[in-house]
């Protein structure tokens, strides 16, 4: 797998999207996880609706949001208040039991907000010894999320 | 007039199956995701499982107690939603309901039931 | 799994009064909850759906409120059509009802 990049900036909203093929994930939940170091496990971070049917309602684990589309084949992610601690290597995944299969690796990069001008020595950036040569950068400026807001499927 | 009306319930021995069928009319049956409920005698209400609309090809969703003897189907040429009972025990009995999943006005829909038939009622007894 | 606490469990009110009946869930919930009312006898009847949405149809003295863990379903002033039981139900881990509240008139 590639590793797809996305930017947000500091204490704005950064929405990933991870397309997949709807029918071969078909019935399947999803998940987004936390890469531990290059090698080390995946650690969940939310997973979508128990019921697949119920994949698109959005589901919240503290700032982290995750709403699937099981009929276009989207997956969505949505940080919101993104800060410089979030920045890392994720996955995507579509769960099958006790397995996971990846459906997009991403990085997230967190940007120097422009108007704040305290010290942007603590935002992460992936430093040269990292090896992200297969990397493309999708730039994700995404809106806040009205409260309450909730994305569903059409059913037809 | 948009209605539900559920029928097949009876007396059946623990064991047995049994089959519910929940009949639509005044609404396009397809673009709707179907489920049922039961409540058990002086009880309360219980989910038991829901079907896709059209759109999901027929995929179920079940309550744990009922997962692998519920089978839950549609058939969309006359607008009836089935709920197929094996293996029924006496802690079944109850009055099943079928309902409608509710849709937005924008064509998407939610898990909250506004239309309901008037229950038909499963007794598993020996 | 998600229990749903309802309370009171029973309640007995004139016309006219303020009812208000609580739902707790025993973990976030986001808005993800719908309040029933059921007659005796009869099919239930969706009242409010995203824990604060009136559904078409149903009279303004019912109202919900509430997120997270804590909801509340209000009927401003009860009318003797009201008799019924009220049933909270969520939809954010699975599809589980409150164990009910029976509104009587004193």
């Known amino acids: 797998h590639n590793t797809t990049v996305f930017q947000g900036v500091a204490g704005q909203s950064l929405q990933v999207s991870c397309p997949y093929d709807s029918m071969k994930h078909w019935g399947r939940r999803k998940a987004w996880c936390r890469q531990l170091g290059e090698k080390g496990p995946c650690q969940r971070v939310v997973s979508t609706h128990n019921l697949w049917l119920l994949s698109f309602l959005r589901r919240w684990n503290g700032s982290t949001a995750i709403t699937d589309d099981t009929l276009g084949g989207t997956l969505t992610i949505t940080l919101r208040n993104l800060q410089p601690h979030d920045a890392g290597l994720y996955q995507c995944q579509s769960l099958h039991g006790s397995e996971a299969d990846t459906l997009r690796k991403v990085l997230v990069e967190v940007l120097a907000d422009p108007l704040d001008h305290r010290d942007a020595g603590d935002l992460w950036f992936p430093g040269e010894s990292e090896s992200f040569e297969d990397a493309h950068v999708e730039h994700s400026i995404s809106r806040s999320l009205l409260e309450g807001e909730i994305p569903f499927p059409p059913t037809s | 007039e948009v209605q539900l009306v559920e029928s097949g319930g009876g007396l059946v021995q623990p064991g047995r199956s049994l089959r519910l069928s929940c009949t639509a009319s005044?609404?396009?049956?397809?673009?709707?995701?179907m489920s049922w409920f039961r409540q058990a005698p002086g009880k309360g209400l219980e989910w038991v499982g829901f079907?896709?609309?059209?759109?999901?090809?027929?995929?179920?969703e079940y309550t744990a107690s009922v997962k692998g003897r519920f089978t839950i189907s549609r058939d969309g040429s006359k607008s009836i939603a089935y709920l197929q009972m094996n293996s029924l025990k006496t802690e079944d009995t109850a009055v099943y309901y079928c309902?409608?999943?509710?849709?937005?006005?924008?064509?998407?829909?939610?898990?909250?039931?506004?239309?309901w038939g008037q229950g038909t009622m499963v007794t598993v007894s020996s | 799994d998600i229990q749903m606490t309802q309370s009171p469990s029973s309640l007995s009110a004139s016309v006219g009064d303020r009812v208000t009946i609580t739902c707790q869930a025993s973990?976030?919930?986001?808005?993800?909850l719908n309040w029933y009312q059921q007659k005796p006898g009869k099919a239930p009847k969706l009242l409010i759906y995203d824990a604060s949405n009136l559904e078409t149809g149903v009279p303004s003295r019912f109202s919900g409120s509430g997120s997270g863990t804590d909801f509340t379903f209000t009927i401003s002033s009860l009318q003797p059509e009201d008799i019924a039981t009220y049933y909270c139900q969520e939809y954010d881990q699975y599809l589980t009802f409150g164990g009910g509240t029976k509104v009587e008139i004193k």
């Open positions: 309902a409608r999943g509710k849709r937005r006005d924008y064509g998407y829909w939610h898990p909250a039931f506004d239309v």
């Open positions: 005044g609404f396009t049956f397809g673009d709707y995701a």
């Open positions: 079907i896709g609309s059209k759109a999901y090809g027929g995929t179920t």
């Open positions: 973990q976030d919930i986001t808005n993800y």
